[in-house]
């Protein structure tokens, strides 16, 4: 993925067996053909957190070999470690693996700060957590890669799960889960439901935490509350959507809306923070410090580099303003807002101070890129994947972080004029120069 | 130019509290450009932050002295105070007073300190 | 919790001299370090911000380099002015809390 501070995320965390839940009472009535409204055997398959990335368990080959693989909505490989490095517990070892395919092509992909190279080949993939399907499917075995793999970290691969024009070497590379949806009956549409801790966990407790869902193929409704909202996806690329209004505590940032989607604005699970272009973020900060200014914090804190703490229990949530981003609805000149709490915005970091604080990095961060609603936008929602559909949807998640007066929000419809003029127009030469 | 100068009894016995004030000259108190902050130095060792606070009355402590530090800000007089409850001897030390300062970072000023020895 | 720690504890050099003295963070702290120098007798003094910039009117013989875990204060040419105990400070956590154990530059 191109962004430069994107990949890989961090995970730290343990080995420790994925925990189900015990079913959950929903009401099941299908939404669509294929569709039923409780995946038991899917919920709780993540781990992870924010400034982590979330990980699902993954079998490759004959006999199943298992990794561990961070869930990407913001490229479109499926890659992983293939060969020993200092960092990785384990990798996938082809020579094991009786139907494992090489594809004799390398494929390179550079990022601003790092790199990842390896050989394409296929080879059967399955996710115990996930459909009961196998499906052979395009794997680009890493061999090299700096500033990849992270010390610490418990996963060993990536699933992009955007679409083919972005995959590596190009676009006739076919993404896994076009893979999937091709050769079985599971539906075109996945949904992620990722779940912030809200303060920050020990490694002990991340070993017993519980990272949150990818229902494939389905939505389950247990994981929401309220109404699902979609928002049209702008074309099939990264998951790309339009934001047409922002607003600070309810007040608009007053933009020309075009400036919230330069040059793009996506939906990437692989991000960290809500990654927003040089003058909104600008924009956005100066009325985020306005509507917090009974205290003071250092620029470094703003720029997302410094930590504040405060006394264990007494982070003064409600000093921060909520952060609404409204999208372009499927219906003409209709939009609705998702709203943001600081509890997402504020990503709570270990080990800094005693154990009597709890410390906090600023999550929204300057982009050259457009915005990126990574997990801190996510954290908030169930967000659904519908690919067949050309949608992405939005509901208030089940396990999203708040206080007793304030909780994340998804609401509409509100009346909203010229839409379509808030998108972006990449230049055609622009495109093929982008840095990955 | 601005000054800090620490003021208060230099004799506290133990159990008792300790009440320091610092009269900021030279400046207003409640400029938006600073914090301000304690720090002290017991006798022959090393410096420990004690806490900081904004003209606003927004305060920070030293999570080892929480529970028995209050620090208050009095903007009309331009002083800023430091309480210490239960005090022992080892809260003995040299006391300042500084400006938190460099876009609320670094203590770029300090009043010369007051030597405080908690005796009975 | 963050952790500074100095050295050496004690430095013993005569005027004229270079003096290199090291501030070591428990993890990174980025370029959020001060130095401060202390006169017996003196409140400190800030010398260093953010790990490389003087502080208004700080000599040029003071500098301050690294980044991360490492850091380091060069005194390029010691003045007899400069022999005194020198502290470093992180403020990666804020509010800045925490100060290292001091180093002692005395005279040979």
């Known amino acids: 993925t191109q962004h430069g501070i994107r990949l890989p995320l961090r995970s730290g965390l343990g080995g420790a067996p994925l925990g189900l839940r015990l079913p959950r009472e929903t009401d099941e009535e299908p939404e669509e053909p294929g569709r039923r409204g409780s995946f038991v055997e899917m919920v709780d398959n993540l781990r992870g957190k924010s400034g982590q990335g979330y990980y699902v368990e993954m079998t490759v080959g004959s006999p199943p070999q298992t990794l561990n693989i961070l869930v990407d909505t913001g490229s479109s490989n499926f890659a992983v470690g293939a060969a020993p490095h200092p960092f990785l517990h384990r990798y996938y070892q082809r020579q094991l693996s009786s139907t494992y395919r090489d594809l004799r092509k390398g494929v390179y992909v550079p990022y601003t700060q790092g790199k990842w190279e390896g050989e394409l080949g296929t080879d059967l993939v399955s996710i115990p957590h996930g459909p009961n399907v196998t499906v052979r499917a395009n794997i680009a075995a890493i061999t090299e890669s700096d500033k990849f793999f992270i010390n610490g970290s418990n996963w060993e691969g990536i699933l992009g799960l955007a679409y083919a024009e972005i995959a590596r070497p190009d676009d006739s590379l076919e993404p896994f889960f076009d893979s999937l949806v091709k050769q079985t009956h599971v539906p075109n549409l996945f949904s992620l439901q990722l779940c912030g801790a809200g303060f920050p966990l020990n490694q002990s407790e991340v070993l017993a935490s519980v990272g949150g869902s990818m229902i494939i193929g389905g939505i389950d409704h247990s994981l929401y509350t309220g109404s699902l909202w979609y928002t049209p996806i702008r074309r099939e690329w990264y998951y790309e959507v339009i934001i047409v209004r922002v607003e600070i505590n309810g007040q608009d940032l007053k933009m020309d809306c075009k400036e919230y989607n330069y040059d793009k604005s996506i939906v990437d699970s692989g991000t960290t923070n809500l990654r927003l272009p040089k003058k909104v973020f600008e924009a956005a900060v100066k009325s985020i410090k306005a509507a917090s200014s009974t205290e003071k914090f250092p620029d470094g804190f703003w720029l997302g580099e410094q930590l504040v703490c405060w006394q264990a229990g007494t982070t003064p949530w409600n000093i921060f303003p909520v952060i609404s981003l409204y999208l372009m609805g499927e219906v003409t000149n209709q939009s609705f807002r998702i709203t943001i709490l600081p509890q997402q915005y504020l990503r709570p970091v270990e080990d800094v101070a005693t154990s009597q604080d709890d410390c906090y990095k600023f999550a929204i961060s300057q982009s050259s890129t457009g915005t990126v609603m990574g997990a801190v936008i996510m954290e908030g929602f169930y967000v659904v994947f519908d690919r067949a559909r050309k949608r992405i949807g939005f509901a208030v998640s089940a396990c999203h972080v708040h206080d007793e007066f304030r909780t994340a929000a998804v609401e509409g419809p509100f009346v909203t004029l010229d839409m379509e003029d808030c998108g972006y127009n990449i230049p055609q030469t622009d495109e093929s120069t982008l840095m990955t | 130019q601005l000054q800090l100068q620490e003021s208060g009894p230099g004799l506290v016995k133990p159990s008792e509290t300790l009440s320091l004030t610092c009269t900021v000259s030279?400046?207003?108190?409640?400029?938006?450009?600073?914090?301000w902050g304690w720090i002290r130095q017991p006798p022959g060792k090393g410096l420990e932050w004690i806490g900081n606070?904004?003209?606003?009355?927004?305060?920070y402590y030293n999570p080892s002295l929480r529970g028995r530090v209050t620090i208050s800000v009095d903007t009309s007089k331009n002083q800023f105070s430091l309480k210490l409850s239960s005090v022992t001897a080892a809260d003995t030390a040299v006391y300042y007073c500084?400006?938190?300062?460099?876009?609320?970072?670094?203590?770029?000023?300090w009043g010369r300190g007051t030597l405080v020895t908690v005796s009975s | 919790e963050i952790v500074l720690t100095q050295s050496p504890a004690t430095l013993s050099l005569s005027p004229g001299e270079r003096a290199t003295l090291s501030c070591r963070a428990s993890?990174?702290?980025?370029?959020?370090l001060a130095w401060f120098q202390q006169k017996p007798g003196q409140a400190p003094r800030l010398l260093i911000y953010?790990?490389?910039n003087r502080a208004t009117g700080i000599p040029a013989r003071f500098s301050g380099s690294g980044s991360g875990t490492d850091f380091t204060l060069t005194i390029s040419s010691l003045e007899p002015e400069d022999f005194a105990v020198y502290y470093c400070?992180?403020?990666?956590?804020?509010?800045?809390?925490?100060f290292g154990g001091g180093t002692k530059v005395e005279i040979k």
């Open positions: 953010d790990a490389s």
């Open positions: 030279g400046g207003p108190i409640s400029s938006s450009s600073y914090y």
């Open positions: 500084a400006r938190l300062g460099h876009g609320y970072n670094y203590f770029d000023l």
């Open positions: 400070q992180q403020v990666y956590v804020w509010p800045p809390r925490t």
């Open positions: 993890q990174s702290v980025s370029s959020y």
């Open positions: 606070i904004y003209y606003s009355g927004s305060t």
